[in-house]
Amino acid sequence: VKMAETCPIFYDVFFAVANGNELLLDLSLTKVNATEPERTAMKKIQDCYVENGLISRVLDGLVMTTISSSKDCMGEAVQNTVEDLKLNTLGR
Amino acid sequence: EICPAVKRDVDLFLTGTPDEYVEQVAQYKALPVVLENARILKNCVDAKMTEEDKENALSLLDKIYTSPLC
């Protein structure tokens, strides 16, 4: 949950690619005004996930989730929250 | 804002070699089945995507990272 809060559109696109769902990917890419060549590039990546099957998608999703919830990222998220709180306090 | 570790993972997935990418994944999930899967996907992407495709994927990522939705 926390990782999706940091950059929701990234995770939208990532999971649409890894999921192999072309319609979902198109919807996600529309949100960032992706050009046709950019869409083509993302679909080539998506093809690799589709070709390698469900287990491949699950395993790579696991990698992304693990990285996103690692101390490298969570430490960053906590640090950002602390900075935000400091700014808000100073703002008052 | 996207986490730098995630950004590095995605950058290596697109622009690195399979060896580099798998080494990066291993820092977070050192299971042999996960690492072999990462290598398979990376090699697949390298074979499918041209230099131009990768440029386009990188420009899309820039749009994502700078989007108000990120």
Partner: antibody, heavy 120, light 106 residues
């Protein structure tokens, strides 16, 4: 056009050291991964090492690991191979080769090679 | 370490004939296989990348196929200038060359 020119080869005694260089031109050197590949007299090609575009990551074949060091100077468009503890079996023509940008191919352009002879 | 085995080691073929060189990997390497041509006293030149993609400027008589562990380089109508040694290279994990196949014109 892409040009790779190796230099630094020569005759060296077993146990000795040698530093090979590869001067690159005709492309943005700092964008590309680079390799060293060798070919012993009358034999096939053997990949020995590659280095990432920034120089931060290096990989080696087992036959040279711990003895050879690949490095680069992007400001000078140069690739290097430091060879220590040289053995007779290191006698070969040494080629530098460029990888396609973003790992889109391994070894798309090669230099003409420089000859290293290890003999007492 | 992935071992690449080419066959045959040597082939003598008449002009205009078809040449087939195979390369077998000791494990699945997907499509991460490249083919090179080396003429005597010259440096190698890339012919085919990722199993079947022709490199720019390479004559159309050269083609590649295969995936997984078995790969083929085909020269459709051999010309005199094709006399050379041909090598496969895997880039699936690190890099390994096959031992080479020498093609001679009859």
């Amino acid at each position: 056009q892409v040009q790779l020119v190796e230099s630094g080869g020569g005759l060296v005694k077993p146990g000795g050291s040698l530093r090979l260089s590869c001067a690159a031109s005709g492309f943005t050197f700092s964008d590309y991964y680079m390799n060293w590949i060798r070919q012993a007299p009358g034999k096939g090609l053997e990949w020995i090492s590659y280095i990432s575009s920034s120089g931060s990551t290096t990989y080696y074949a087992d036959s040279v690991k711990g003895r050879f060091t690949i490095s680069r100077d992007n400001a000078k468009n140069s690739l290097f191979l430091q060879m220590n503890s040289l053995r007779g079996e290191d006698t070969a023509v040494y080629y530098c080769a460029r990888d396609g940008r973003y790992n889109t191919v391994a070894g798309d352009y090669w230099g003409q090679g420089t000859t290293v002879t290890v003999s007492s | 370490e992935i071992v690449m085995t080419q066959s045959p080691d040597f082939q003598s073929v008449a002009p205009k004939e078809k040449v087939t060189i195979t390369c077998r990997a000791s494990q699945n390497i997907g499509g991460s296989l490249h083919w090179y041509q080396q003429k005597p006293d010259q440096s190698p030149k890339l012919l085919i990348k990722y199993a079947s993609q022709s490199f720019s400027g390479v004559p159309s008589r050269f083609s590649g196929s295969g995936s997984g562990t078995d790969f083929t380089l085909t020269i459709n109508s051999l010309e005199a200038e094709d006399a050379a040694t041909y090598y496969c290279l895997q880039s699936y994990t690190l890099r390994t060359f096959g031992q080479g196949t020498k093609v001679e014109i009859k």
